[in-house]
Amino acid sequence: MAQGTLIRVTPEQPTHAVCVLGTLTQLDICSSAPEDCTSFSINASPGVVVDIAHGPPAKKKSTGSSTWPLDPGVEVTLTMKVASGSTGDQKVQISYYGPKTPPVKALLYLTGVEISLCADITRTGKVKPTRAVKDQRTWTWGPCGQGAILLVNCDRDNLESSAMDCEDDEVLDSEDLQDMSLMTLSTKTPKDFFTNHTLVLHVARSEMDKVRVFQATRGKLSSKCSVVLGPKWPSHYLMVPGGKHNMDFYVEALAFPDTDFPGLITLTISLLDTSNLELPEAVVFQDSVVFRVAPWIMTPNTQPPQEVYACSIFENEDFLKSVTTLAMKAKCKLTICPEEENMDDQWMQDEMEIGYIQAPHKTLPVVFDSPRNRGLKEFPIKRVMGPDFGYVTRGPQTGGISGLDSFGNLEVSPPVTVRGKEYPLGRILFGDSCYPSNDSRQMHQALQDFLSAQQVQAPVKLYSDWLSVGHVDEFLSFVPAPDRKGFRLLLASPRSCYKLFQEQQNEGHGEALLFEGIKKKKQQKIKNILSNKTLREHNSFVERCIDWNRELLKRELGLAESDIIDIPQLFKLKEFSKAEAFFPNMVNMLVLGKHLGIPKPFGPVINGRCCLEEKVCSLLEPLGLQCTFINDFFTYHIRHGEVHCGTNVRRKPFSFKWWNMVP
């Protein structure tokens, strides 16, 4: 039960006090008791419940005509059952007794009021009155947890605007309101109560820049909402009429959880006594609601695809046709960024990561815009963000970044359980160097901090700085599977490729050519690849790098070897011993449900079929997956990327609610 104030009574004159329903009010009957008195009794109006405890141990007894010893160990508390119809209509009489004096009476006139700040603390999508039932001042995780949820209002419901909705202090329309969380103030008081009392809504100064609260005029259009709290206003005096009244507030978060903001925002209503104009206002009662800002959540390849993004660039029509066909098979919407908008930047995966935010009443896709800021810089802001599609970015917007800050270097695993610890939304994966050095690359700390602060997809740092581009999507992917954990981890594997080529040579296919049919590309015989000592040394190094990640992933995702599929792939080391795919990197694939868009490797054709394609199909088709090999050689591969790098996918949010997990 909420804490009320302390009321001191005195026999000299009647005491007038306010008691808020649902609070426990302490009665100090000792400090002003007549000197010779040694005991007391209490009588109260039917609407008042008095508890007297004489401890320790505390023996509680409801009032009757009994007398109690007048000593500091006696605790008297009041609660009120109903709100008062008029000021002071509930009475408590304390009678003091002494051996030689007649009884001395002290009178307390109580006004019972109902003041309750309600939000969706039960996470049902509805605001229900919760007075005296739950403590709204704490926020707890898990299926039995409680606490309200706020969305960062980071979409743009107004298409004429270039800013996010949370960047202005206006409510555009009902669409804008739906992105906010409802909070209701319920009051029931005597008609004249607010002539001597005031209600103030407030937020801590440390949180005022993270939240905005709009007050709605009930029954009127949303355009009647006016801002009452926010970055410029930590508190607001409310004009509340007496009697029974409900006041609606709409609350939007302005910031995502981050290293300097744990994501919790407390809104408090304070009842102030303003009856004495000569004195400052006195706090009579406070009620608070704590909200947690919904985290930004990534979606893994195992979530159903809803929309595919790609770029139109010079001469990639065939690539786009293949992606279009794949999207149609997977029943996905397709969005193509035209040449004039992408400015010859085709790397859609690197520019953005599409996740979502969720409250019980609303789910919103949100694009996380990377700070790489090349030709596609404007695409997430201008073309992706919009009505019911949010936007967030982090990191320096001018310089100070590396290739590891592109979001080909940001992936998320499917849900996993690791040594008994559940990650129902999976774990974020990003690449790093294995140790810091003068020229090693790492994901910008601001990005790392943001990802960690979301709490619900605890990040795992992998080693990717050995790659020229340096992205985790160059050596791993996840595909859905009907058995085991519901997915397989795919890892690029030089060892598997050498094994395959050796088998082909043993069967007399040593003359078969890699890169056959590619104009202006020097073809390589299987036997020459197998006999090239330098290439073998390079791939031995690459294998060690991938194996390091393999063990890391097994440990951090709780995987067994049988959860991993090795995809045959060779690499070559280029300048500064950085690795690049020797032929199109098949693990860098587009996963649309059971439909896979895999870079066409142009492997040796044996018996009319590419042996690399055949091998990959034999590994993936038993899982119910359909492999489509896409020619990305000149448009993507030779520019240091593949199909996954050149595409992006919006996926269906998890059915699991993030607040039901325990981070």
């Epitope: 090239n532 390079h538 080391l573 280029k574 500064f576």
Partner: antibody, heavy 128, light 111 residues
Framework: QVQLVESGGGLVKPGGSLRLSCAAS????????VSWIRQAPGKGLEWVSF????????YYADSVRGRFTISRDNAKNSVYLQMNSLRAEDTAVYYC?????????????????????WGRGTLVTVSS | QSALTQPRSVSGSPGQSVTISCTGT?????????VSWYQQHPGKAPKLIIY???ERPSGVPDRFSGSKSGNTASLTISGLQAEDEADYYC???????????FGGGTKLTVL
């Protein structure tokens, strides 16, 4: 073959900044590794910085690390060297140089360590 | 003080051969096959004449040849000609924190 032209040099006070540009013509610079090399008056060559063709990693000499930043804009066919906190010992002719990354051998590393195309250089003078 | 050591100057008569040495350490010249040589005429930009120890870019006469033994690389110019008079610089990839090193340069005089 690509041709390179440096610009942006000039006189600057110690502690000041300059941004050098290296513009390419005759070919697409995105196919090339690019390095900056400098030569102080009457002295030898000193390697300064490198950026790979994919624009995904960079390297610096100890003498400039933390003060200089190399970057590239393949759409503009240019590479840049942002020089901050300049010192008197940074006075030199700055050359932009490149090596083609479009190599077809099974393994052909090393092209980022040599420079087969050079610009004519731009003079940077740091003096109060 | 340059990281790779070259003689300050060498000279030779037309038609003769000269060799310029470039001494490094086991962390650069001795470790990698990424040694290159540049020719620089006064007031001009350097020009690549040898890369990967002994390979010649197209257009460079076969009078120029490169080799390496241990931590020392060498440039040999046979059949010296007047236009060979220039400064010559060696360069190597290095595992040190500065990944490309140059020698201090050698002035070749054709007598």
């Amino acid at each position: 073959q690509v041709q390179l032209v440096e610009s942006g040099g000039g006189l600057v006070k110690p502690g000041g900044s300059l941004r050098l540009s290296c513009a390419a013509s005759g070919s697409t610079l995105s196919d090339y590794f690019v390095s900056w090399i400098r030569q102080a008056p009457g002295k030898g060559l000193e390697w300064v910085s490198f950026i790979n063709s994919a624009n995904t990693f960079t390297y610096y000499a100890d003498s400039v690390r933390g003060r200089f930043t190399i970057s590239r804009d393949n759409a503009k066919n240019s590479v840049y060297l942002q020089m901050n906190s300049l010192r008197a010992e940074d006075t030199a002719v700055y050359y932009c140089s490149s090596a083609n990354d479009d190599v077809d051998d099974i393994v052909a590393p090393g092209r980022g360590y040599y420079m087969d195309v050079w610009g004519r250089g731009t003079l940077v003078t740091v003096s109060s | 003080q340059s990281a790779l050591t070259q003689p300050r100057s060498v000279s030779g008569s037309p038609g003769q051969s000269v060799t310029i040495s470039c001494t490094g350490t086991s962390g650069d010249v001795g470790r990698y096959s990424h040694v290159s040589w540049y020719q620089q005429h006064p007031g001009k930009a350097p020009k690549l004449i040898i890369y990967n120890v002994y390979e010649r870019p197209s257009g460079v006469p076969d009078r120029f040849s490169g080799s390496k033994s241990g931590n020392t690389a060498s440039l040999t110019i046979s059949g010296l000609q007047a236009e060979d008079e220039a400064d010559y610089y060696c360069s190597s990839h290095s595992r040190s924190s500065t990944p490309v090193l140059f020698g201090g340069g050698t002035k070749l005089t054709v007598l």
